[in-house]
Interface confidence: low
């Protein structure tokens, strides 16, 4: 194995419109040009890239659905973070929709956890 076969750690370039790829890759927040000679900045609020890449296009920012609120807006290096509206939650096994939280517990049970954007209310038997 030659000296060149090991990979020097890539340092993130400061944010700028255009820069040169390092070993054929562009830093987060950029994509590569068609001729692979330039790194082009993603458009803030429109698209993004999260890691070193040779994408010809940045990834499109997610738009929050109705029933969701935007917790973090899309930057050039991070996708939008959407969260279910108050009173609704997202189940792990069906993450595509926000479900309504239950309003109360069945008879004989007490609420031990409130509704959050990630989980329904939690009920336990009174005696437990």
């Amino acid at each position: 194995i030659t000296r060149q076969s090991l990979d020097p750690q890539r340092r993130a370039a400061p944010q700028q419109k255009r820069s040169s790829p390092i070993e054929g890759l562009c830093p987060p927040g950029h994509h590569i040009s068609e001729d692979s000679r330039e790194c082009i900045s993603c458009k803030y609020g429109q698209d993004y890239s999260t890691h070193w890449n040779d994408f010809l296009f940045c990834l499109r920012c997610t738009k929050c659905d109705s029933g969701e609120v935007e917790v973090n807006s899309c930057t050039t290096t991070r996708n939008t973070v959407c969260q279910c509206e108050e009173g609704t939650f997202r189940e792990e096994d069906s993450p595509e929709i926000c479900r309504k939280c239950r309003t109360g517990c069945p008879r004989g049970m007490v609420k031990v956890k409130d509704c959050t954007p990630w989980s329904d209310i939690e009920c336990v038997h009174k005696e437990s």
């Epitope: 194995i1 000296r3 060149q4 076969s5 090991l6 990979d7 020097p8 750690q9 890539r10 070993e23 054929g24 890759l25 890691h51 070193w52 890449n53 040779d54 994408f55 990834l59």
Partner: antibody, heavy 121, light 118 residues
Framework: EVQLVESGGGLVKPGGSLRLSCAAS????????MHWVRQAPGKGLEWVAG????????YYADSVKGRFTISRDNAKNSLYLQMNSLRAEDTAVYYC??????????????WGQGTLVTVSS | QPVLHQPPAMSSALGTTIRLTCTLR?????????VYWYQQRPGHPPRFLLR?????????GPQVPPRFSGSKDVARNRGYLSISELQPEDEAMYYC???????????FGSGTQLTVLS
């Protein structure tokens, strides 16, 4: 949950061929580089081949160059390793591993359980 | 001589701290490389533990507790994996690795078998 499941291993005669598959789920397969790493019985890890997120760039260890071909089908969330002209020294457990970068080897952050390839007459 | 050298075996008592070593051959400079560490328990696939370049540039693997930490000694051309509060489940083979240019390869060390003494 990220899952990588290898299949296609088995017993093959020297000079024979085998095609390994790796089914990926739980992440956006088309934006990650992928690799095959093998481990001979009782031995250490040996990187075999790597492919970038789009399948445009493929890389091989000298020991398999010209005999093995790595490929991917992003529509099927699948990674493949076509192994030809197999030798006894190719006997190993073959692991499919995800790269934490799109193209460059950064860290092999998730691994499958592996599939055993035995080359013997 | 391999590019990455690891002692074949090390042992330490339950609850203690141990430091595993990965020495880069001296025709390479560890100062410009990240060091990766993987754990492999018997009968299991490898698991990514961490990547270490510097104190300000490092990353922990998925669900890897902070008991596992990385460091480097540039003068000695070595990478280290420290494991504190050793537990029985830490008994495993530990491989260091270094990434290669443009995704070309991952160079693995030969591995260190860690034994946890009760």
């Amino acid at each position: 949950e990220v899952q990588l499941v290898e299949s296609g291993g088995g017993l093959v005669k020297p000079g024979g061929s085998l095609r390994l598959s790796c089914a990926a789920s739980g992440f956006t397969f088309s934006t990650y580089g992928m690799h095959w790493v093998r481990q001979a019985p009782g031995k250490g890890l040996e990187w075999v081949a790597g492919i970038n997120y789009s399948g445009n760039n493929k890389y091989y260890a000298d020991s398999v160059k010209g005999r093995f071909t790595i490929s991917r089908d992003n529509a099927k969330n699948s990674l493949y390793l076509q192994m030809n002209s197999l030798r006894a020294e190719d006997t190993a457990v073959y692991y499919c591993a995800r790269d934490s970068s799109t193209t460059r080897t950064r860290a092999l952050d998730y691994w499958g359980q592996g599939t055993l390839v035995t080359v013997s007459s | 001589q391999p590019v990455l050298h690891q002692p074949p075996a090390m042992s330490s008592a339950l609850g203690t701290t141990i430091r595993l070593t990965c020495t880069l051959r001296n025709d390479h400079d560890i100062g410009v490389y990240s060091v990766y560490w993987y754990q492999q328990r018997p009968g299991h696939p490898p698991r990514f533990l961490l990547r270490y370049f510097s104190q300000s540039d490092k990353s922990q693997g998925p669900q890897v507790p902070p008991r596992f930490s990385g460091s480097k000694d540039v003068a000695r051309n070595r990478g280290y994996l420290s494991i504190s509060e050793l537990q029985p489940e830490d008994e495993a083979m530990y491989y260091c690795a270094m990434g290669a240019r443009s995704s070309v390869t991952h160079v693995f060390g030969s591995g260190t078998q860690l034994t946890v003494l009760s």
